[in-house]
Interface confidence: medium
């Protein structure tokens, strides 16, 4: 049978800057925690992402807010804790 | 009022190994096709992303299927013209 | 499991606007469009139109482009359609529903919210 | 916009009999890219639809094997062997080739 082929519309629907789930290392939001390891070691968290059709603009966030999430922190030696840590989402992207 | 917080549960669900929407550039799955422009620039795919709770352990594709997707491809002095490119989705993603 | 949630049934004055909510839960949000179906007696269904969430992206049928504003929030995972200028034949049941796009193979909805009454009346 | 035709409007039927509707559309369903998106969804009173059938004659999760699509180009049929009485409603069939994605006017299967 043919391919099915997705259209210019839906890929350029889907392409353009947008909030999009990524997961990011929690180590790589809190930086000062490098010698603690966390569970789970990354978090999913709405970034902007995409491209803008122009290579002189950028997707970027022009709203954001905070997430708060509930994570194991594990310290060599000592019994894991359950700690809340606050991450920035992004609510709102637009190329600029 | 009180912060809202993600429990442990759904933080370690959401992070978890699995196939997640990432734009990705069409040039970097097309390399040889780096003098040409594409519009759009990036197409949205299926990669495993994640993490496994274990750091000797990685996220990977152990399932994988093509998807053939309508582009503009503009050359220099050239009309565009509509290209079918194919790319590869990730399906099923493991720890291993 | 995915599950679409709306807002409770609105009774509202001509000329007034209203704005319907949708929230979603259950899979990655923006990743799958949203759309908004009309459905009255006599009519049967009605597509208005469809956002994909966090973008800019969203069709409409042209019979309700100026109608109907789709609008969506990725940080609470809700979509939201407002219809204007509100007379008597905007009065009907409003779904919003998940469709895959033809990006995962053809663009029908394959989950919807339990509907929203919308009654127009002076 | 397509227009999207049901026949019968209603349809009475006894509990393990066959039932059996079609939907014809105004242009033809296949798309560009060779695919026919053509769907149908079920309406049970006070509910909203729920997606049985998807490009022809794919059944969505949970659909019973008794309910089957068939069909092509202009035409199309759904069929329900063994009708039981969890299956009365409204059947509506749905067209996403062309823009705006337009639906048939519905057939009410009622039980004897």
């Known amino acids: 049978s043919e391919v099915e082929v997705v259209p210019f519309q839906e890929v350029w629907g889907r392409s353009y800057c947008r909030a999009l789930e990524r997961l990011v290392d929690v180590v790589s939001e809190y930086p000062s925690e490098v010698e603690h390891m966390f569970s789970p070691s990354c978090v999913s968290l709405l970034r902007c992402t995409g491209c803008c059709g122009d290579e002189n603009l950028h997707c970027v966030p022009v709203e954001t807010a905070n997430v708060t999430m509930q994570l194991l922190k594990i310290r060599s030696g000592d019994r894991p804790s359950y700690v809340e840590l606050t991450f920035s989402q992004h609510v709102r992207c637009e190329c600029r | 009022s009180e912060v809202e917080v993600v429990p442990f549960q759904e933080v370690w669900g959401r992070s978890y190994c699995r196939a997640l929407e990432r734009l990705v550039d069409v040039v970097s799955e097309y390399p040889s096709e780096v003098e040409h422009m594409f519009s759009p620039s990036c197409v949205s795919l299926l990669r495993c992303t994640g993490c496994c709770g274990d750091e000797n352990l990685h996220c990977v594709p152990v399932e994988t299927a093509n998807v053939t997707m309508q582009l503009l491809k503009i050359r220099s002095g050239d009309r565009p013209s509509y290209v079918e490119l194919t790319f590869s989705q990730h399906v099923r993603c493991e720890c291993r | 499991q995915v599950h679409l949630q709306q807002s409770g049934a609105e009774l509202m004055k001509p000329g007034a606007s209203v704005k319907i909510s949708c929230k979603a839960t259950?899979?990655?949000?923006?990743?799958?469009?949203i759309e908004w179906v009309k459905q009255r007696p006599g009519h049967g269904l009605e597509w208005i139109g469809e956002?994909?969430?966090?973008?800019?992206?969203?069709n409409f049928n042209e019979k309700f482009k100026d109608k109907a504003t789709l609008t969506a929030d990725p940080s609470s995972n809700t979509a939201y359609i407002q219809v204007s200028s509100l007379t008597s034949e905007d009065s009907a049941v409003y779904y919003c529903?998940?469709?895959?796009?033809?990006?995962?193979?053809?663009?029908?909805?394959?989950?919807w919210g339990q509907g929203t009454t919308l009654a127009v009346s002076s | 916009d397509v227009v999207m035709t049901q026949t019968p409007l209603s349809l009475p039927v006894s509990p393990g009999d066959q039932a059996s509707i079609s939907c014809r559309s105004s242009?033809?369903?296949?798309?560009?890219?060779?695919?026919?998106?053509l769907h149908w969804y079920l309406q049970k009173p006070g509910q909203s639809p729920k997606l049985l059938i998807y490009?022809?004659?794919n059944r969505f999760s949970g659909v019973p094997d008794r309910v089957s699509g068939s069909g092509s180009g202009t035409d199309f049929t759904l069929k329900i062997s063994r009708v039981e009485a969890e299956d009365l409603g409204v059947y509506f069939c749905?067209?996403?080739?062309?823009?705006?994605?337009?639906f048939g006017g519905g057939t009410k299967l009622e039980i004897k």
């Open positions: 242009q033809s369903l296949v798309h560009s890219n060779g695919h026919t998106y």
């Open positions: 529903a998940r469709s895959t796009g033809f990006y995962y193979g053809g663009n029908y909805f394959d989950h």
């Open positions: 749905s067209q996403s080739t062309h823009v705006p994605p337009t």
């Open positions: 956002i994909l969430p966090g973008s800019v992206s969203n």
């Open positions: 490009k022809v004659s």
């Open positions: 259950g899979y990655t949000f923006s990743s799958y469009w």
